[in-house]
Amino acid sequence: TALSPAPTTMDFTPAPLEDTSSRPQFCKWPCECPPSPPRCPLGVSLITDGCECCKMCAQQLGDNCTEAAICDPHRGLYCDYSGDRPRYAIGVCAQVVGVGCVLDGVRYNNGQSFQPNCKYNCTCIDGAVGCTPLCLRVRPPRLWCPHPRRVSIPGHCCEQWVCEDDAKRPRKTAPRDTGAFDAVGEVEAWHRNCIAYTSPWSPCSTSCGLGVSTRISNVNAQCWPEQESRLCNLRPCDVDIHTLIKAGKKCLAVYQPEASMNFTLAGCISTRSYQPKYCGVCMDNRCCIPYKSKTIDVSFQCPDGLGFSRQVLWINACFCNLSCRNPNDIFADLESYPDFSEIAN
């Protein structure tokens, strides 16, 4: 009765072969499937087997795999046959080592989080670097600070707001000497003196396909900065949007497929269909990014009956500009993001 995410021992009965050293056949045609699909453990995808025949529970990290019993694609697993030379028949599910990133000459591994400087925290995700600002740029309430300005303070990474009061004598912005906002690590739980702050969403971690966008917010019981995340998809990877640019034009700012679609995530399907807009592309150096967007909650239903919801970026409009002419300047987007207030909702 013990559960394991996928079978740890596989009872393969390959068809008899003349040459026993050759590769066994794990697929049989016509397909022979059990009358009903199996029940998969929580967190394990129900997928179609490698023979394109039957439903099966995807093999997990460290499980044996074959051309029939395939590894969980939603977890970035592949079948490593290197231990079964020369037959290459039975492998072991292994993690796809994602593409690393290079920033300012420094190489970072896929999934690695790092701070290139004191103002940003970044993560390398499959060759793309996504960053969140560590300096909270909240403006102090006008009620007790009508003339704020930001100043650099020696020994502090982040600029701080100071107030110019009527006597033209600068003072820190927060009343009762609670201290001004500094780097996230230095923000204390403010309780009653808490200034609610939510940073803009960071740019999507991928330029096409499913990515992640993050932001920092202290809107919680502890008034402590926490990272929130949402899924984002700026444009599909499998559509060449260049071919859709009209003759004589250099850009297509927004691309919207004609048919509505369901979002899919880890083998689960959104409970309703959507007709999303995507940002387009340009023929020149300009790039297209969202400037009117919001966050929606998408509910997913899985084959095993379970459901969950995720926050997802919903693009309303995009614009194309030269701000990302230098693809290595990953901070350019972050600096300009607060200017578009629609993005941070």
């Epitope: 013990a2 559960l3 009903s36 699909p37 029940r39 453990p41 967190g43 997990q60």
Partner: antibody, heavy 117, light 112 residues
């Protein structure tokens, strides 16, 4: 043999927090979904929350949603339950239990959480 | 959520006599794989629950064969052919077909 040992229970005031732990041994912890189930004094069993084998999928009972957080550390063979904003009606023995695909096959001995002012 | 309703809630039995506990679910418990995930647990006084039966009628190892489970659809039964003193405790049914898992209120078995 499979063993699940809960710890971290105690007396706490309403509104405060508590973190329960469950140490697992005798099986490959990282391959099993795990549950927390509770039992108020003199009452029946109430399912609280579950986490998948790798923590990627988590579900909560409506009564604890937004207040309790289940997590696991597979490298330490340990399951956790972070309980915030505790209420008097959270008073119960909390059991850690192993999932068996539509069932629960092993239970810990339980740890008592008393929420009282 | 699926509501599990047990009856009776209290069951006084004479040692050596049979006992029967009913469990009814508010919706069908057949999963898409064809299995019915209905479980029975025993909780002796001061102890943790212990699984007796899974998937309606499968007995766990170490469980005496005087315990048996039956039923289908929404109606299920746990039978004890001859009650012994060590069987005293509370018996719970639990469905594991739909999320979240849900338990019955429990049936307290005591010796007359």
């Amino acid at each position: 043999q499979v063993q699940l040992v809960e710890s971290g229970g105690g007396v706490v005031q309403p509104g405060r927090s508590l973190r329960l732990s469950c140490g697992a041994s005798g099986f490959t912890f990282s391959r099993f979904a795990m549950h927390w189930v509770r039992q108020a004094p003199g009452k029946g069993l109430e399912w609280v929350t579950v986490t998948s084998f790798d923590g990627s999928e988590i579900y909560y009972a409506d009564s604890v949603k937004g207040r309790f957080t289940i997590s696991r550390d597979n490298s330490k063979n340990t399951l956790y339950l972070q309980m915030n904003s505790l209420r008097v009606d959270d008073t119960a023995v909390y059991f850690c239990a192993r999932d068996a695909l539509g069932s629960i096959d092993y239970w810990g001995q339980g740890t008592l959480v008393t929420v009282s002012s | 959520d699926v509501v599990m309703t047990q009856s009776p809630l209290s069951l006084p039995v004479t040692i050596g006599q049979p006992a029967s506990i009913s469990c009814r679910s508010s919706q069908g418990l057949v999963y898409s794989d064809g299995n019915t995930y209905l479980n029975w647990f025993q909780q002796r006084p001061g102890q943790s629950p212990r699984r007796l039966i899974y998937k309606v009628s499968n007995r766990d190892s170490g469980v005496p064969d005087r315990f048996s489970g039956s039923g289908s659809g929404t109606d299920f039964t746990l039978k004890i052919s001859r009650v012994e003193a060590e069987d005293v405790g509370v018996y719970y049914c639990m469905q594991g077909t739909h999320w979240p898992y849900t338990f019955g209120q429990g049936t307290k078995l005591e010796i007359k």
